[in-house]
């Protein structure tokens, strides 16, 4: 969490941002809130990106003002116009690109004053893993698959029964480049699994950590998946 304050001229206002991550090819949110104003026409929101020649987005007098928007963001940005009046300056970024990563500044002007706060935005690819029993294998085998990851993650297997066990010798992980030549499909196979046990396939890079669990008993198979972004710090 980053909290910024205005410095000169009028009074300063508090602006708060939250570091976040974007999943390439999908839409992302750059979060920013500020002390609200009673008149929408008095609010100016500027989003800037470090090292970029134009603006990321500008909203003033109740509407977008995009004459100085940088071409790398053309047609890809929007604020939540109906929420600006209550202090929400968050930016929706469409079709997140790898090159959208960097330091952004949310700069606010209201009748009360000015303020800004920076946020770090990471980009990559992350997806939920699915763990299945591989019935084609000669021995009891589990197969963990996740369709889109970038940068290349690490994959670790764990077991509820054999806690602390190292499964690296009885597992095999491969990374297959997807058609867009950036993200990769992750496939990890765990051999010699035992029944009545819960196994976890944990995939992690510097952006996200995802876990796929599978519980195999003689009568049923239960699955559960979980994904957590690693860098959501507020400023």
């Amino acid at each position: 969490l980053i909290i910024g304050f205005g410095i000169s001229g009028r009074h300063s206002i508090t602006v708060t941002t939250v570091a976040s991550a974007g999943n390439i090819g999908e839409d992302g949110i750059l979060s920013c809130t500020f002390e609200p104003d009673i008149k929408l026409s008095d609010i100016v929101i500027q989003w800037l990106k470090e090292g970029v020649l134009g603006l990321v987005h500008e909203f003033k007098e109740g509407k977008d003002e995009l004459s100085e928007q940088d071409e790398m963001f053309r047609g890809r940005t929007a604020v939540f116009a109906d929420q600006v009046i209550v202090g929400n300056a968050s930016l929706r970024l469409k079709n997140v690109q790898l090159t959208d990563a960097g330091t952004y500044k949310c700069y606010i002007i209201t009748s009360k004053g000015k303020g800004n706060a920076n946020l770090e935005y990471k980009t990559g690819a992350f997806s939920m893993p699915e763990v299945n029993v591989d019935y084609n294998a000669s021995s009891e085998t589990l197969r963990c698959e996740a369709p889109r990851w970038f940068p290349q993650p690490t994959v670790v297997w764990a077991s509820q029964v054999d806690q602390g066990a190292n499964f690296s010798e009885v597992s095999n992980t491969s990374f297959e480049l997807n058609s867009e030549n950036v993200t990769m499909k992750v496939v990890s196979v765990l051999y010699n699994v035992t029944i009545n046990n819960t196994y976890s396939c944990m995939i992690e890079n510097d952006i996200a950590k995802a876990t796929g669990d599978i519980k195999v008993t003689e009568s049923e198979i239960k699955r559960r998946s979980h994904l957590q972004l690693l860098n959501s710090k507020a400023s």
């Epitope: 500027q46 800037l48 990106k49 470090e50 090292g51 970029v52 020649l53 134009g54 603006l55 100085e68 940088d70 071409e71 790398m72 690109q97 090159t99 959208d100 990563a101 960097g102 330091t103 500044k105």
Partner: antibody
């Protein structure tokens, strides 16, 4: 101390290619856009190209569009200008300059290299 | 692209004179204008940015004004080291454009 050091200039025939480099030090290179500016002998300054800090955006003057390519390697703190299909009118001293950090807020072109001479002649 | 036109192209002045150089943009560049000084055989040096902000270390005899399309660089009292060529530069669009330059010579 901020330093920019260009290299790679020289004599090249019309239609030929050349790659200029600019080694940067003394500042956080990836935080700044960078530009190339040229100056023909006895003439004024002409902006050639710029690139955003992360390298995701590139910008060119009409006179070089389609022939020149700007790039950067932030791990090496180095800016490049690949010049293809060179013409006599591309003869100039080429400067690299530190461009903007934050749009509308910061200085730009506050540091320049010493320049490297490119001569296009048969 | 925005075109920048400087006037005059050259001028002769004496030490102590007040010198004014103007720069006109073909379309509004708001306040996104810089002024540079260049001496023969040297790289340019930034004097003014954002139309009127003085770059750190630049003497206060240099000042800039204007917004939109019309801008002015003023040297309040010309010093011997100020004889050089001065360029305006817009940065209000993704391109950056320089004026053709104004050479300040000794009278």
């Amino acid at each position: 101390e901020v330093q920019l050091l260009e290299s790679g200039g020289g004599l090249v025939q019309p239609g030929g290619s050349l790659r200029l480099s600019c080694a940067a030090s003394g500042f956080t290179f990836s935080s700044y856009a960078m530009s190339w500016v040229r100056q023909a002998p006895g003439k004024g300054l002409e902006w050639v190209s710029a690139i955003s800090g992360g390298g995701g955006s590139t910008y060119y003057a009409d006179s070089v569009k389609g022939r020149f390519t700007i790039s950067r390697d932030n791990s090496k703190n180095t800016l490049y200008l690949q010049m293809n299909s060179l013409r006599a009118e591309d003869t100039a001293v080429y400067y690299c300059a530190r461009d903007i950090q934050w749009f509308g807020e910061s200085t730009l072109f506050d540091y320049w290299g010493q320049g490297t001479l490119v001569t296009v002649s048969s | 692209d925005i075109q920048m036109t400087q006037s005059p192209s050259s001028l002769s002045a004496s030490v102590g004179d007040r010198v004014t150089i103007t720069c006109r943009a073909s379309q509004s560049t708001r306040s996104w204008l810089a002024w540079h000084q260049q001496k023969p055989g040297k790289a340019p040096k930034l004097l003014i940015y954002k139309a009127s902000s003085l770059e750190s270390g630049v003497p206060s005899r240099f000042s800039g004004s204007g917004s939109g399309t019309d801008f002015t660089l003023t040297i309040s009292s010309l010093q011997p080291e100020d004889f050089a060529t001065y360029y305006c530069q817009q940065y209000g669009s993704y391109s950056r454009t320089f004026g053709q330059g104004t050479k300040v010579e000794i009278k």
